[in-house]
Interface confidence: low
């Protein structure tokens, strides 16, 4: 963008402030909340988005877990600390000096502690299970059509390489989308599954993060796919560390 152009916006993140003050008068966008410069050619990291969203209400969710080590985001929103690249810092603390460790998608993976709590590394979430229930339709969707449409959506809307969409399961009315991405598989420039899942979650809720695009209009062979419930499970490369008290 040059300074004379008035379409200085961030197509992939509406929660930004943009101005033509980059090198050569190019459009530069900064995330609300953190003021960090964002790359509008790709998805913004979930950490920066959460930081920008801090005024939104909490949402708590609980359901039976698909595996003993799966995490569900029951803590809802918090104001996260992000590193210079926009990733979650391994240790998060609130204003009352209560601290906890998070994974790469910002979900708590330890009991809460005090400022002495150590989180040695940011543990990668390598497997995300998105569990959807769709509204009743005249009949079940064709599984292969549904599979193709969801893979297309993740590729074209969220720029997630199809190799990271491990599977799409369907048993009417439940749809499960499995995203898998090990540290070794993720090349420079690849969208992170955690970021794609977060954009998808916000789209499903009618809270699209994209600038100026219409909301998500999901259709399978012309039939609208309307989601009435979403639950997301996160599996980390290293299992979480909770005390037995929490697990009972």
């Amino acid at each position: 963008h040059t300074a004379a152009q008035d379409n200085c916006t961030c197509p992939t993140n509406k929660m930004t402030v943009c101005s033509p003050d980059g090198p050569g008068g190019r459009c530069q966008c900064r995330a609300l909340g953190s003021g960090m410069a964002v790359d509008c050619s790709t998805l913004t990291s979930k950490c920066l988005l959460l930081k920008a969203r801090m005024s939104a209400p909490k949402n708590a969710r609980t359901l039976v877990r698909p595996s003993e080590h799966a995490l569900v985001d029951n803590d809802g929103l918090y104001d996260p600390d992000c590193d210079p690249e926009g990733r979650f810092k391994a240790r998060q603390c609130n204003q009352t000096s209560v601290c906890w460790c998070v994974n790469s998608v910002g979900v708590r993976r330890t009991d809460k502690g005090d400022l002495s709590l150590r989180c040695d590394e940011l543990v990668r979430t390598h497997h995300i299970l998105i569990d959807l229930r769709h509204r009743p339709t005249a009949g079940a969707f064709n599984h292969s059509d549904l599979d193709a449409e969801l893979r297309r959506l993740f590729r074209e809307r969220y720029r997630l390489h199809p190799k990271f969409v491990a599977a799409v399961h369907y048993e009417q009315p439940t749809i499960q989308i499995e995203l898998r991405q090990n540290t070794s598989q993720k090349a420079a420039g690849d969208v992170d599954i955690g970021d794609a899942a977060y954009y998808f979650e916000r789209d499903i809720k009618g809270e699209s993060l994209f600038q100026g695009r219409g909301g998500l209009d999901l259709r399978v062979r012309g039939e609208p796919l309307q989601v009435e419930r979403t639950l997301i499970y996160y599996l980390d490369e290293i299992p979480p560390k909770f005390s037995m008290k929490r697990l009972t």
């Epitope: 197509p11 992939t12 509008c40 050619s41 720029r159 420079a188 695009r213």
Partner: antibody, heavy 121, light 107 residues
Framework: QVQLVQSGAEVKKPGASVKVSCKAS????????MQWVRQAPGQGLEWMGW????????KYAEDFKGRVTISADTSTSTAYLQLSSLKSEDTAVYYC??????????????WGQGTLVTVSS | DIQMTQSPSSLSASVGDRVTITCKAS??????VAWYQQKPGKAPKLLIY???YRYTGVPSRFSGSGSGTDFTLTISSLQPEDFAVYYC?????????FGQGTKLEIK
Amino acid sequence: QVQLVQSGAEVKKPGASVKVSCKASGYTFTTAGMQWVRQAPGQGLEWMGWINTHHGVPKYAEDFKGRVTISADTSTSTAYLQLSSLKSEDTAVYYCARSGFGSSYWYFDVWGQGTLVTVSS
Amino acid sequence: DIQMTQSPSSLSASVGDRVTITCKASQDVSTAVAWYQQKPGKAPKLLIYSASYRYTGVPSRFSGSGSGTDFTLTISSLQPEDFAVYYCQQHYITPLTFGQGTKLEIK
């Protein structure tokens, strides 16, 4: 739908310059890269370079460095290829094509219709 | 630069035949290979990317496989509209390079 529409055919004299335009529609221009590929009559495809439309940064194939300029105008969603010091061997169809930004995505999913550039004295 | 060598350079086949075109990279390109179909006077069309992913709208008779240096495009049952020139391309590193093309003709 996603479309790339290129400017019309050109006839140029050796030593002259040519500028080919490629107007994108149906998607957000700055969320995809624009590549340029040429094809001489009866020959295969040859990559010339590409531009990261978001950052405005071009990259050129070694064979064309110094003669080629790739640019983008985000206000009109248009990419440009300028080739100078034309030779008869530059007679070819020039294509713009959309790609992603990272190497995992440097394949070309949408192509322009092509612009025939003829270099003849 | 990475050289992409296609074989055969031309091929005659009949409708209903199973056809295989191969592409060899001069060095490891992981799975970053795309395949295109081009008909006379037209721009190429993307068929396969990242070695094995079929692009939206491409018929299921087209499939791709391979990794490292050896890649294959297979058409399981040739249709009349499949007679064209096919190109492979590595999208691993710049400069991006194409194979020389394989012309698929009617026998």
